[in-house]
């Protein structure tokens, strides 16, 4: 028995942030979950992770260096990444494994989500026009 | 209280195979994963790899992916290391330990240890 | 594969003497490095995780610092039960692996 999983299939970070929502066909309240988010069309970069459990607060956190964070809805985790760079464009799958009660579940692979990351725009603000160009 | 009780010492020939139990009580089996750590004599602890017991997942260190045999019987909440194809280099004390499977990256409760003797 | 080189591999130090041990990771493991004590014929014990977090019941004197590639364990007044072996281990990603270990003895 596999867990079904929503997701966007393309967000645009524009200021280097995004908020990915994850939405499952299971509901979390009480049960003890890690919910995880994969870089890359292998999955081979493990974003983020949130861990949650009935008796104490969800905990985020990032081994390899990214700024996120994560909200719990009864069926669903949002991911909140910030500091994205250009370069960190990429396919991005949620992952959600229950590991208490038994039996342990996970999901079906989902579709993932394209997030385009576009580079923080430096134009001139109209009331403080910047040097003019040739 | 939250244990690891491994089983007893064992002498074996070399060529010979091994296999090592770890019965875990006091926590929920399934939020950690086991780890397997060795120590030879006077020397450092060298991590041989891990088992998940919900989906028993693996995870080898290179150097025993060939030989180290990682299972788990949730049944009984024990977990266990084969070894096979024994050296005298494998003389080691070999130890499980736990790491949780939403916060994994320490080892916080260890076993008692095996001592596994490789001689002819 | 990510190696963990600590230093010294031993020291002498007396009751009472403040105590630097060092690891270097070969890349960058941003805070994911714990520090065991380990006496002879017993298991390790956890004493710091995640670089700088004490564990449960270890005492106050032991303290953790660094981030990236470069770690410090310190024992800020050595007592007689603190002689004994100390390692330092990545749990950033797999496989996971230790230090060479640092003997504490009894100067």
């Known amino acids: 028995n596999k867990i079904l999983v929503k997701q966007s299939p393309m967000l645009v970070a524009y200021d280097n942030a995004v908020n990915l929502s994850c939405k499952y066909s299971y509901n979390l309240f009480s049960r003890e979950f890690r919910a995880s988010l994969h870089k890359g069309l292998d999955s081979a970069v493990e974003v983020c992770v949130v861990y949650g459990n009935y008796s104490q607060q969800l905990q985020v956190y990032s081994k390899t260096g990214f700024n996120c964070d994560g909200k719990l809805g009864n069926e669903s985790v949002t991911f909140y990444l910030q500091n994205l760079y250009v370069n960190q464009t990429d396919i991005y799958f949620c992952k959600i494994e229950v590991m208490y009660p038994p039996p342990y579940l996970d999901n079906e692979k989902s579709n993932g989500t394209i997030i385009h990351v576009k580079g923080k725009h430096l134009c001139p603000s109209p009331l403080f026009p910047g040097p003019s160009k040739p | 209280q939250v244990q690891l009780v491994q089983s007893g010492a064992e002498v074996k020939k070399p060529g010979a195979s091994v296999k090592v139990s770890c019965k875990a009580s006091?926590?929920?089996?399934?939020?950690?994963?086991i780890h397997w750590v060795r120590q030879a004599p006077g020397q450092g602890l060298e991590w041989i790899g891990c088992?998940?017991?919900?989906?028993?997942?693996?995870n080898y260190n290179e150097k025993f992916k060939d030989r180290a045999t990682l299972t788990v019987d949730t049944s009984i909440s024990t977990a266990y290391m084969e070894l096979s194809r024994l050296r005298s280099d494998d003389t080691a004390v070999y130890f499980c330990?736990?790491?949780?499977?939403?916060?994994?990256?320490?080892?916080?409760?260890w076993g008692q240890g095996t001592t596994v003797t490789v001689s002819s | 594969d990510i190696q963990m080189t600590q230093s010294p591999s031993s020291l002498s130090a007396s009751v009472g003497d403040r105590v630097t041990i060092t690891c270097h990771a070969s890349q960058n493991i941003y805070v994911w490095l714990n520090w065991y004590q380990q006496k002879p014929g017993k298991a390790p014990k956890l004493l710091i995780y995640?670089?700088?977090n004490l564990h449960t019941g270890v005492p106050s004197r032991f303290s953790g610092s660094g981030s990236g590639t470069d770690f410090t364990l310190t024992i800020s007044s050595l007592q007689p039960e603190d002689f004994a072996t100390y390692y330092c281990q990545q749990g950033q990603t797999y496989p996971y692996c230790f230090g060479g270990g640092t003997k504490v003895e009894i100067k």
């Open positions: 995640k670089a700088s």
């Open positions: 006091g926590y929920t089996f399934t939020s950690y994963y």
């Open positions: 088992i998940y017991p919900g989906n028993v997942n693996t």
């Open positions: 330990t736990r790491s949780h499977y939403g916060l994994d990256w320490n080892f916080d409760v």
